[in-house]
């Protein structure tokens, strides 16, 4: 059995960012499981004093696109589109620095999901990064267009 599937997003937790677009899942049953865990994580985030407004504005859509990545339509095999590395780094090192430290020491917040590792993402100018998912972090836009 091949691994990796493209299927329409059927959830609620990330619907405002993803709609019903086609997302990549490693296995057929994974979407429901991750949906439950993202819902639980968002509930915990909503009641947490650990999350600043400047972080949550971009961390929540970023987490949705990480958990339910769009399928790469240019690929002949099912393949996820990645987050953009420059935005990932600004999120981790600037906007959400404190929150990332907290999340790293409390991995059960995300349950089945690993925290995004920016080092896993292709360098911004590489061909592999051309199709990355851009959240729209203002500082990253500036960084992206002027470097």
């Amino acid at each position: 059995e091949e691994d990796g599937f493209c299927q329409p997003y059927r959830g609620i937790a990330c619907a405002r960012f993803i709609g019903n677009r086609t997302v990549y899942m490693e296995s057929l049953h994974m979407q429901g499981e991750i949906e439950n865990q993202i819902t639980a994580a968002f509930t915990m985030i909503g009641t947490s004093s650990h999350l600043s407004d400047k972080c949550s504005q971009f961390a929540i859509p970023s987490l949705c696109h990480y958990a339910f990545p769009y399928c790469d339509e240019t690929s002949s095999v099912p393949k996820p589109r990645d987050l953009c590395r420059d935005e990932c780094e600004i999120l981790e090192n600037v906007l959400c620095q404190t929150e990332y430290i907290f999340a790293r020491s409390n991995p059960m917040i995300l349950m089945r999901l690993k925290l995004p590792n920016c080092e896993d993402l292709p360098q911004p100018e590489s061909p592999e990064a051309a199709n990355c998912i851009r959240i729209g972090i203002p500082m990253a836009d500036h960084h992206h267009h002027h470097h």
Partner: antibody, heavy 120, light 110 residues
């Protein structure tokens, strides 16, 4: 079907070099980490290192750092372990295994292993 | 040098329950170490059983369960079957490197 197949093992003299390959099929390696794990005859498992083929980021065990290099060719869906300055204690069966970049799960698929013997 | 410790060997009767543990020389094992458990039978490649303390890999029987117990990671087998006789390894994550334990030889007798 998901499969990992190692090749390139054999007999090599101390100080010599060898390159192992790990050919993946049934999945795209860019969505995963590819680990190398070795097992000396009659001994336990030892983690060697891993690569994130998507970015080329690599991490190594202290015992092999500076001598071993992990790389990947995403167009061939294959990872490699380049072993230089080989020592007798590097004699082992070398396995490659995959690990999800996104999800918490154990290394879920392993190759059958390839034997590397370092001896004069 | 970080050391991950396991019981060298354990014996259990068929149908019984046994718990294997995995400790770290750096202190208490937490979920942040993402404890992994693997099974290896003679002449075979290892097989992933559990990741992230408690998440079963597809195909892992429900009689296997993972937890944290007294500052260690634990693998519990309930209703042990003869085919569970094998070497069991744990592995812990230390920010960008994995360290395997020495393994526990589980013998099923009876």
């Amino acid at each position: 079907e998901v499969q990992l197949v190692e090749s390139g093992g054999g007999l090599v003299q101390p100080g010599g070099s060898l390159r192992l390959s790990c050919a993946a099929s049934g999945f795209n390696i860019t969505g995963y980490y590819i680990h190398w794990v070795r097992q000396a005859p009659g001994k336990g498992l030892e983690w060697v290192g891993y690569i994130s083929p998507n970015s080329g980021s690599t991490y190594y065990a202290d015992s092999v750092k500076g001598r071993f290099t992990i790389s990947a060719d995403t167009s061939k869906n294959t990872a490699y372990l380049q072993m230089n300055s080989l020592r007798a204690e590097d004699t082992a069966v070398y396995y490659c295994a995959r690990d999800s970049r996104r999800y918490v799960r154990p290394f879920d698929y392993w190759g059958q292993g390839t034997l590397v013997t370092v001896s004069s | 040098q970080t050391v991950v410790t396991q019981e060298p060997s354990l014996t259990v009767s068929p149908g019984g329950t046994v718990t294997l543990t995995c400790g770290s020389s750096t202190g208490a094992v937490t979920s942040g170490y993402y404890p992994n458990w693997f099974q290896q039978k003679p002449g075979q490649a290892p097989r992933g059983l559990i990741g992230g303390t408690k998440f079963l890999a597809p195909g892992t029987p429900a009689r296997f369960s993972g937890s944290l117990l007294g500052g260690k990671a634990a693998l519990t087998l309930s209703g042990v079957q003869p085919e569970d006789e094998a070497e069991y390894y744990c592995a812990l994550w230390y920010s960008n490197r994995w360290v395997f334990g020495g393994g526990t030889q589980l013998t099923v007798t009876g």
